[in-house]
């Protein structure tokens, strides 16, 4: 190999050992029969050498550094050449370094031809092995602007006072051009400006200088985004830290075309703007740090550019001004992560503050819009509290558990609407009355409707789930002792048409001691399946529930239990079941922890089933499933 560097070229070539490998045989650079492990060639020198091994790329690397001095004379601006040409260099991993020194008042601009650059974070590497490491200078201090791969959006980087650009090419890479040019600009009065150009939909992840270490104190860095006017951009901060400021405040500033409040100033912890049409700038401003405990300022953020959907130009008014104690959350529904680029899905408040989650609270009118390619990726969860504090005022009062129209008119699917129903302890109880009788969801007879009501205790210490209920059954009402949550859960978009025909009211009624009472009026046509609350986990300790089962005059009811034994083992107390005829008050009592469950029994009149639990030993819980079937009476037994 022969490397000849012209005089005054300000180029130095250094061939040195790369990262040591576990290769058995060492390799050397051979010059006039001398074996060396490092070779430095300066401007005006010409050196002929060979290697002592077949694969020098496994042993050596080559660095070609060109110093460009813009302090003493004119700067050689324009397209930067790879000198010496890669064809003249040995096939080693090579790094071309351009070190440009300039006055503080001179702006330097690196312009990258297509493909543009993509910034990578610590620990990341470029697929093709080609990396661009760019750093700047503040007085004598080197500041890392970032490491970049090909195929991105970064088109220009502007700095002042000097720039160091290192292009790393793997030994096998055929690239023979630098891919960038240098231009001079007027002073940019900041650390640097990075321009990022989007041709179409896509995303870019960018980082503050020195990331993941701290951004230089009291510095300013700007990113300029060029976005086609027909697309929308949203900014989200992926990671940030704030330093301890003595003076001034760390912040980001946006210059958004068309905004009447430019620059728009945000704290790093604020929700960042979204749904921005066209070009915009983002600047990161540091502060004067506390000398004793400076901390670090750093920022990693993502800009997502995508087509505005039909919905993004529509403003939806969600009027919760007449609601009390209600919150509505629009959020992404859980999905498997995809590896390919997925456009963001955001909900925007007042069209500007966009995020993947948004919570609206009662008492105000909210204007929202969507920036999302597919609104089925979002759903809504709503919680409303209906509480009674004064039992004299609430008693016998009824409330409709209805989903407000404004919510149903949003283009996002409702997942859950939960009503928390709160009563004064030991003063009042609750009764739920459905417009259409309800069916309890069981394995034997599952609900197949587009929505269900999930009823559970709302007392924090109590783990009591009454069950899931859907329209089209025999449960006429559900009475519960104390605080509960009733959740309307939807399973299909068609739920709206069905739910709008299924009312549910809650009334506050005088207090009673049982945990729950189900009023059941079976239809002659079908078998009613009923099960104890907390199925699969067991009825809680010392809990009592009842079923009030109506039997029409011309019918007989068959009560059937689906196990021979309850399976409960009591640690303390007794578990028992009472079946009581309502007309005669005749009752049968069964010890659930000892007796076998009754065989199918026939009831000619309305009757009660009451189940009371003991304190069971763990793993031996009380779970009972039974059915009621009506058949016409053949003989009048009255």
């Amino acid at each position: 190999f022969e490397i000849a560097l012209p005089r005054e070229s300000n180029i130095t070539v250094l061939i040195k050992l790369g990262t040591p490998t576990l290769l058995a045989k060492p390799c050397y650079i051979v010059i006039s029969k001398r074996h060396i492990t490092m070779l430095s060639i300066k401007s005006g020198e010409r050196i002929v050498f060979t290697f002592s091994c077949q694969s020098p790329e496994n042993h050596f690397v080559i660095e070609i550094q060109k110093n460009i001095d813009c302090m003493s004379g004119p700067c050689p601006f324009g397209e930067v050449q790879l000198q010496p040409s890669t064809s003249l260099l040995p096939t080693l991993n090579r790094t071309f370094i351009w070190d440009v020194k300039a006055h503080k008042s001179i702006g330097l601009e690196l312009q990258f031809s297509i493909p543009r650059l993509r910034q990578i974070g610590p620990g990341e590497s470029c697929p093709d092995g080609v990396t661009h490491s760019i750093s700047g200078r503040i007085d004598a201090t080197v500041v890392r602007i970032g490491t970049f791969c090909s195929n991105g959006t970064v088109s220009r980087i502007k700095m002042q006072e000097g720039v160091k650009m290192a292009l790393h090419l793997p030994w096998f890479h055929p690239r023979n051009v630098s891919g960038f040019s240098i231009a001079n600009r007027s002073s940019i009065k900041r650390l640097c400006i990075i321009e990022s150009v989007f041709e179409g939909e896509g995303s870019a992840t960018l980082m503050s200088a020195n990331y993941p270490e701290g951004f230089p104190e009291d510095e300013l860095m700007t990113w300029q985004f060029v976005v086609p006017a027909h697309l929308r951009a949203s900014v989200s901060f992926l990671n940030f830290n704030l330093s301890n400021c003595e003076r001034k405040e760390e912040r980001v500033e946006y210059y958004i075309p068309g905004s009447t409040t430019n620059p728009e100033v945000f704290k790093l912890e604020d929700k960042q703007p979204g749904n921005m049409a066209g070009n915009f700038n983002l600047s990161l401003q540091g502060c004067d740090q506390d000398a004793q405990s400076p901390g670090i300022l750093r920022l990693q953020f993502q800009v997502l550019v995508q087509h505005p959907q039909n919905e993004s130009n529509k403003i939806y008014v969600v009027d919760l001004s007449n609601e009390r104690a209600m919150s509505l959350t629009i959020e992404p529904r859980p999905v498997k992560q995809s590896r390919k680029f997925v456009p963001g899905c955001f909900v925007c408040l007042e069209s500007r503050t966009c995020s993947s989650n948004l919570t609206l609270t009662s008492g105000s009118k909210h204007k929202i819009s969507f920036l999302c390619d597919d609104l089925t990726r979002l759903w809504m969860n709503v919680e409303k509290t209906i509480s009674c504090t004064d039992h004299r005022y609430c008693q016998r009062k009824s409330y409709s558990l209805q989903v407000p129209s404004d919510i149903l008119h949003l283009p996002v699917e409702l997942h859950d609407f939960s009503w928390k129903l709160l009563v004064p302890k030991d003063r009042l109880s609750l009764v739920l009355v459905p417009a259409q009788k309800l069916q309890q969801h069981t394995h034997e007879k599952p609900c197949n409707t587009s929505f269900s009501y999930l009823v559970a205790s709302a007392i924090p210490s109590q783990d009591l789930y009454f069950g899931s209920f859907c329209p089209g059954g025999s449960i006429k009402q559900i009475q519960v002792k104390q605080n509960i949550s009733v959740t309307l859960r939807t399973f299909a978009p068609s739920f709206q048409q069905e739910a709008s025909r299924q009312g549910l009211t809650v009334s506050f009624i005088p207090y009673f001691k049982e945990e729950g009472v189900f009023t059941v009026t079976p239809d002659t046509k079908s078998k009613v399946y009923l099960r104890t609350p907390n199925w699969d986990r067991g009825l809680p300790s010392l809990t009592s529930v009842s079923w009030n089962i109506s039997v029409p005059r011309d019918q007989v009811a068959c009560l059937t239990f689906f196990k021979e034994r309850s399976g409960v083992v009591c640690q303390t107390g007794r578990a028992f079941m009472i079946i009581q005829e309502q007309r005669t008050r005749a009752e049968e009592i069964f010890s659930l922890d000892e007796d076998v469950l009754p065989k199918p029994s026939f009831h000619h009149h309305s009757f009660w089933v009451n189940i009371s639990n003991c304190s069971p030993t763990s793993g031996k819980q009380l779970d009972l499933l039974f059915s009621v079937t009506l058949t016409p009476r053949t003989v009048d037994l009255t």
Epitope: S398, Q402, P404, A435, S450, S494, Q497, S500, R501, G503
Partner: antibody, heavy 122, light 107 residues
Amino acid sequence: EVTLKESGPELKKPGETVKISCKASGYAFTKYGMNWVKQAPGKDLKFMGWINTYTGEATYADDFKGRFDFSLEASASTAFLRINNLKNEDTATYFCSRGDDYGTGGYVLFYWGQGTTVTVSS
Amino acid sequence: DIVMTQAAASLSVTVGETVTITCRASENIYNNLAWYQQQQGKSPQLLVYAATNLADGVPSRFSGSGSGTHYSLKINSLQSEDFGFYYCQHFWGTPPTFGGGTKLEIK
């Protein structure tokens, strides 16, 4: 503006079949269920049932199970009522009507068609 | 099924008067009640829903009240266009049923 436009009057013989159409406009057809209401001459209104315009599933009131059939052509925003094996007592005006998604408002008949008169006579 | 009863089959009233039409449900319908007006040869028109809410475009002389099983529709200062049939309808479950109607006639 929400409008429901029903097909014209029908004169049929007992045992025949009639199919009435109801074309909706001014709203997203598959968002709201379509109800059907019967009014016999000089009589009160009787709810016949409804069809879920999203799923096509029909629900019939007890008196209208068997000979009555609700169907859809969602792409044309049209609901249909077919009555098979017509009887004299089917002589009536049949209205399609749309509820609202207000609370339990699926059965609150906010919008009505102009009605289709079906006369059954031998 | 829930039975809706309108006690008065007809009422004769003078223009300018105030009239109240009543409706009773066979069980508690929790305010899930609507009122309709129907004029000769026309489709019914919604006046009131949820017992008290006035439908869009309905004059404020109409008002609904009641709870539980008893409901009423009040029309202040009757106009000539108010004459016709009035029906109550519950929408508390399936099937929704209508009252027998009250005919409002000019005296």
